[in-house]
Interface confidence: medium
């Protein structure tokens, strides 16, 4: 069961698996959770009556029962790990510990004016898992202003001490704040020959290049097939790192493959989520289950619902045998992955999805595209809302895309005349106009948030968020669409529809059924040749057919210029505006969502 | 692997000028923190200067040499530099040129050999 | 200037014997207290930094303790190349850094 309050001076005995060093118990926590095998956790804070070496360590802790016997001593703090809880769950820590030297390998130093450019520049830089950061009140002039760039094998520190006039944190690379590159190609027949950090069994290059993104010192990896010469090599995936960063010789060899961390976008792809099923492949490890199952999927959700188990392998029955239901092997190891990996032994293998929790909602896969036609169908875009206004009387003002469980992004323009939030409803999960009647649940809105340098579509900025008054319950037909990776800048995305309710021509109506049409993007140069009375800026990016004839319209404003990418959605854009609709070399013009990141996560993860 | 070597020591009459260099390697020298450490034989270690990386005006002196010596570098040589005039008697030490380690807490977690300075008439 | 008094100046041990060498600041110096170790004819040598933290490739027999104004180095079981001098450094208010006046370790 889910327990997610700390015990105050309480301390779980036995089980550790593990000691690490973290600046809170609340941190301490997250560990515990992001650990392959870790229940419980016992926290040990600062206090005259504990040995200042025992002072900030979190001992990471496992349990056949799921729990272990409480024992009472001053300042230690215990709890469970979030793994036994259904919401989700981030790694993302922006907390600044004062007076704290987090310590590690301090690879490099530098002068900053404050602890949050110390912490931008760790953010940025491709080694750092957390900083230490001399104030200008430390009493070393040597040392003033300081900031240390630092990491380890854990990626948590390897002890934590009390040292006046610093501030210490970490990365914010899990809070999708970083503006290093994202390498998402996988190259084939490629060997990496940096050094290895790690190296553990892997069904595929994708689960390969997932562990080396959650792997704290992992840069790039290198997986061998199952068909790589060496037997004993097979399905190993060696996760690498370089001084550089980046791998200093790359080796042709047939049947690897390699590929690079996807550390600064993991918010925009699954990372934990193995959601795939490996056929006449066997999974080893330890076992801790064997269960009836009637099928490979019956088989997984048991795994997933055993929060002891990382992985399984089903046997299908022999025929008529045990009424039709095959062998369910749950099972586990020291660190979330087979200690071996059989093939031609008939088992169909997987991991549990658990810890699909941990990746941004975002990354969920949503059911198939429907290929053809203009109007779309329930469910194939779950983070399209329509922004109706009750005043004068209620109607289709604005399109917006689901973000966060709070928030919807729109367009600013959208709001020319809006009073107050008060008259705003926001509607999920709908198709047709038409579903909305008096009695029709919909999300009120406490806050709108406008960019403050917003004055007209035209000239940029034309963003806005909103806060909804109560939370949005993720379902098949209402959830979020993941923001761009600042990495992913030089992304070019071909897949890229437009949605809404909007006219379909300019002297129209709001339509009844949500419109969709794929629409491909245009260079900026491009799009200035087209509008030479405005200034397209890197802020703004255009879609559209040479010929036109497809283009969003009135009343699409504020929805989403959404593009696959990898298998997951990206908010690529928001509808802003344009010259008529779908008017031949007159492109869409839309607001670069990319380029407004930072301001979104400013204004959604304000505390 | 880090390495610092002293030269330019000898013996000097009083009131004299001499200057000492320090060669570094085995590390981004501009990137850290120089200092110069002395020692008077038979005595404990006495601080003597440092130039900080981080800005060229930042050199600072022990009030027993401010206004005669300067430290200065050369961070396209690797090089650091002792600059002592108008030389006194209790000058006379070997002079440590020494490294200061990034860690919050400042080190000297290198040195040199040390060279050694007379100054007699 | 801070002042750094180490206590004693010298003293004589045996090869086993645990040896404590105190450092005492004239003023709270936090844990801003580092530990160096010179040998006749050689330059010094960094052991313990932050009053507690062993410098990487020293043996774990050299520990530090201390906070404020007291300080203490420890061997706990000396070796024969562990007769030398011994300095405690403070790093809290610099320049200047200031040393202790050393202590000689000497076999008995």
């Known amino acids: 069961e889910c327990v997610t309050q700390l015990l105050k001076d309480t301390c779980f005995e036995g089980g550790d698996i593990t000691t690490v060093f973290t600046p809170s118990a609340k941190y301490c926590q997250v560990v515990c959770t992001y650990h392959p095998r870790c229940l419980l956790f016992t926290f040990t804070a600062e206090s005259p009556s504990e040995d200042p070496t025992r002072w900030f360590t979190c001992v990471l802790k496992d349990s056949v029962t799921e729990t272990l016997p409480r024992v009472n001593r001053t300042a230690a703090i215990s709890g469970y790990s979030f793994k036994q809880c259904s919401h989700q769950i981030s790694a993302c820590n922006k907390d600044i510990y004062v007076d704290l030297d987090m310590k590690g390998i301090n690879y490099n130093s530098s002068v900053a004016k404050s602890a949050q450019e110390c912490q931008e520049r760790c953010t940025d830089d491709v080694h750092c898992h957390f900083f230490t950061y001399a104030t200008r009140q430390f009493p070393s002039l040597e040392h003033r202003n300081i900031c240390l760039l630092k990491h380890t094998q854990t990626g948590t520190p390897t002890r934590i001490t009390k040292l006046d006039k610093v501030v210490s944190g970490f990365s914010l690379k899990s809070c999708a704040l970083s503006n290093l590159a994202c390498i998402r190609d996988i190259f084939p027949n490629t060997v990496f020959a940096d050094s290895n950090i790690d190296s553990v069994m892997a069904p595929d290059a994708f689960v390969c290049g997932r562990i080396c993104t959650h792997h704290p010192g992992c840069l790039f990896f290198t997986f061998f097939s199952q068909e790589w010469p060496k037997e004993s090599q097979r399905n190993l995936c060696l996760l690498k790192t370089s001084e550089s960063g980046l791998p200093s010789t790359r080796i042709k060899k047939s049947k690897a493959l390699s590929g690079f961390s996807l550390q600064s976008c993991r918010h925009s792809i699954p990372v934990f989520c193995h959601s795939s099923f490996y056929h006449d492949t066997d999974f080893l490890g330890e076992e801790l289950d064997i269960v009836a199952a009637k099928s490979h999927e019956a088989c997984q959700k048991l795994c997933t619902n055993a929060v002891r188990c990382q992985f399984f392998t089903y046997t299908p029955a022999q025929a008529s045998c045990n009424e039709g239901k095959g062998k369910c092997y749950l099972k586990l190891s020291s660190n979330g992955s087979p200690t071996k990996i059989l093939h031609g032994r008939g088992g169909i293998s997987g991991y549990t999805l658990r810890l699909c929790k941990m990746d941004n909602e975002c990354t969920t896969k949503i059911k198939p595209r429907i290929v053809g036609g203009t109007a779309s169908v329930r469910g194939e875009w779950p983070w399209q809302v329509t922004l109706h206004t009750t005043s004068p009387t209620q109607r289709h003002l604005c399109g917006g895309s689901i973000i966060g469980n709070q928030w919807i992004l729109t367009a600013a323009h959208c709001f020319y005349g809006v009073e107050s939030p008060k008259i705003l409803r926001v509607y999920s999960g709908i198709l047709n106009q038409s579903e909305i009647k008096e009695d029709t649940s919909f999300f009120g809105v406490q806050e709108i948030i406008i960019h403050d340098q917003y004055k007209m579509a035209e000239s940029g900025y034309d963003i806005a968020l909103l806060k909804l008054e109560t939370t949005v319950n993720y379902t098949d037909s209402q959830r979020p669409i993941c923001l761009p990776s600042k990495g992913d800048r030089n992304v070019i995305y071909t897949d890229c529809w437009v949605t809404g309710w909007g006219y379909r021509k300019l002297r129209d109506k709001i339509q009844n059924t949500l419109q969709k049409a794929k629409i491909p993007l245009v260079t900026n140069e491009e799009c200035q040749k087209r509008y030479r009375g405005h200034k397209i800026t890197h802020k703004m990016i255009c879609a559209g057919y040479r010929e036109g004839g497809k283009d969003a319209c009135k009343g699409d404003s504020g929805g989403p210029l959404s593009c696959k990418h990898n298998e997951v959605w990206h908010l690529v854009g928001i509808t802003s505006w344009g010259e008529g609709c779908a008017q031949r070399e007159r492109p869409g013009v839309y607001t670069n969502v990319v380029e407004y990141v930072d301001w979104i996560l400013e204004k959604t993860q304000a505390v | 692997q880090v390495q610092l070597v002293e030269s330019g020591g000898g013996v000097v009459q009083p009131g004299r000028s001499l200057r000492l260099s320090c060669a570094a390697s085995g590390f981004t020298f501009s990137s850290y923190n120089m200092h110069w450490v002395r020692q008077a034989p038979g005595k404990g270690l006495e601080w003597v200067a440092i130039f900080l990386s981080y800005d060229g005006s930042n050199k600072y002196y022990a009030d027993s040499v401010k206004g005669r010596f300067t430290i200065s570098r050369d961070n396209s040589r690797d090089m650091l530099y002792l600059q002592m005039n108008s030389l006194r008697a209790e000058d006379t030490a070997v002079y440590y040129c020494?490294?200061?380690?990034?860690?919050?807490?400042?080190?000297?977690?290198?040195w040199g050999q040390g060279t050694l300075v007379t100054v007699s008439s | 200037d801070i002042q750094m008094t180490q206590s004693p100046s010298s003293l004589s041990a045996s090869v086993g014997d645990r040896v404590t060498i105190t450092c005492r600041a004239s003023?709270?110096?936090?844990?801003?207290l580092n530990w160096y170790q010179q040998k006749p004819g050689k330059a010094p040598k960094l052991l313990i930094y932050?009053?507690?933290s062993l410098q990487s490739g020293v043996p774990s027999r050299f520990s530090g303790s201390g906070s404020g104004t007291d300080f203490t180095l420890t061997i706990s079981s000396l070796q024969p190349e562990d007769f030398a001098t011994y300095y405690c450094q403070q790093s809290y208010s610099t320049p200047p850094i200031t040393f202790g006046q050393g202590t000689r370790l000497e076999i008995k």
């Open positions: 020494a490294k200061s380690e990034i860690l919050v807490v400042p080190t000297l977690d290198y």
């Open positions: 003023q709270s110096i936090s844990s801003y």
């Open positions: 932050a009053a507690s």
